[in-house]
Amino acid sequence: LECYSCVQKADDGCSPNKMKTVKCAPGVDVCTEAVGAVETIHGQFSLAVRGCGSGLPGKNDRGLDLHGLLAFIQLQQCAQDRCNAKLNLTSRALDPAGNESAYPPNGVECYSCVGLSREACQGTSPPVVSCYNASDHVYKGCFDGNVTLTAANVTVSLPVRGCVQDEFCTRDGVTGPGFTLSGSCCQGSRCNSDLRNKTYFSPRIPPLVRLPPPEPTTVASTTSVTTSTSAPVRPTSTTKPMPAPTSQTPRQGVEHEASRDEEPRLTGGAAGHQDRSNSGQYPAKGGPQQPHNKGC
């Protein structure tokens, strides 16, 4: 089997003139292409991988939301020579007619990394953007994290920074098939220069309170009380995007082989994230679970 092979990291790495053709190893009978896009309120970028795949032919499309950071994934596996150059690598959704609404700044500034390399997104070197509220979405937190796409034995990753709807999330993430968007949120202007080591303590979690020992009396002493929280408290998100399927056929999981030295594969569903807020609202972060390893 021959497949197109390329890697795109917010550049034109998968443009027609940069794609190569590779011969797959014996026993590999699918070509794969995976595209992941991230949109902040200040812009969007995409990652893409094409190459020899594993598993069965099929197509998968998913929309995810992480505190107002939107992520969209498309996966396609096919069993013909050079069949893996069908997916759009950038958004084609926006109608050119109409003007983008103007939003006044809400007073918060964040570092913004939208398609920047890891080198360009270090510390305080990225550009600073003014956050704003859009419709009933309030963007008063700053985010520092990463997006990772794994397919065809290749893992690509880019940093993500920008304005979000949560000021206190810690090492939070959403996952789709072969895709992860994760990071932490913070409160205050330009607080997102580096949140890699952020701990779970936040103003919303009450501290451990030590009560003084009771005064000695003739009556048997009562048990002293301590208060603590057994788990981090996640603030409730108030809004979610209603991310529509891209294909008229049933959306099934598409299996991808993760890079050998990377994390285990994330296949077919929201593998690593349970939304602990807004249960019953849709879509749940990560979208509906998909059957594992089914063809379309």
Partner: nanobody, 117 residues
Framework: QVQLLESGGGKVQPGGSLRLSCVVS????????MGWYRQTPGKQRELVAH???????NYADSVKGRFTISRDNSKNTLYLQMNSLRAEDTAVYYC???????????WGQGTLVTVSS
């Protein structure tokens, strides 16, 4: 599949108001853009307004300041609040949703808005 059902159309006098609703059902897991379009006889469908998943909105120049698009995710519903209606707003209004990549979109059946004295 995604199904869209509009409601709220009707006849109203110039200067009046109407609120259109569009209930979205089915597999909504990758909807990115939700919008309202309108069409008058013999003309092409034109964008009225759309709203992205992160709340950002776009409006046609002709309705800016008079119409407001919003969405209630808990009710799976898209709205269009139309104020200061004019005769030229008379049209069939269609709800539209599409995915981020633009490779799939769905339309409602339309609801008629008539602005006349």
């Amino acid at each position: 599949q995604v199904q869209l059902l509009e409601s709220g159309g009707g006849k109203v006098q110039p200067g009046g108001s109407l609120r259109l609703s569009c209930v979205v059902s089915g597999d909504t897991s990758s909807i990115y853009l939700m919008g309202w379009y309108r069409q008058t006889p013999g003309k092409q469908r034109e964008l009225v307004a759309h709203i992205r998943g992160n709340g950002r909105t776009n409006y046609a120049d002709s309705v800016k300041g008079r119409f407001t698009i919003s969405r209630d995710n808990s009710k799976n519903t898209l709205y269009l609040q139309m104020n200061s209606l004019r005769a030229e707003d008379t049209a069939v209004y269609y709800c539209n949703v599409r995915n981020f990549w633009g490779s799939a979109e769905y339309w409602g059946q339309g609801t008629l808005v008539t602005v006349s004295s």
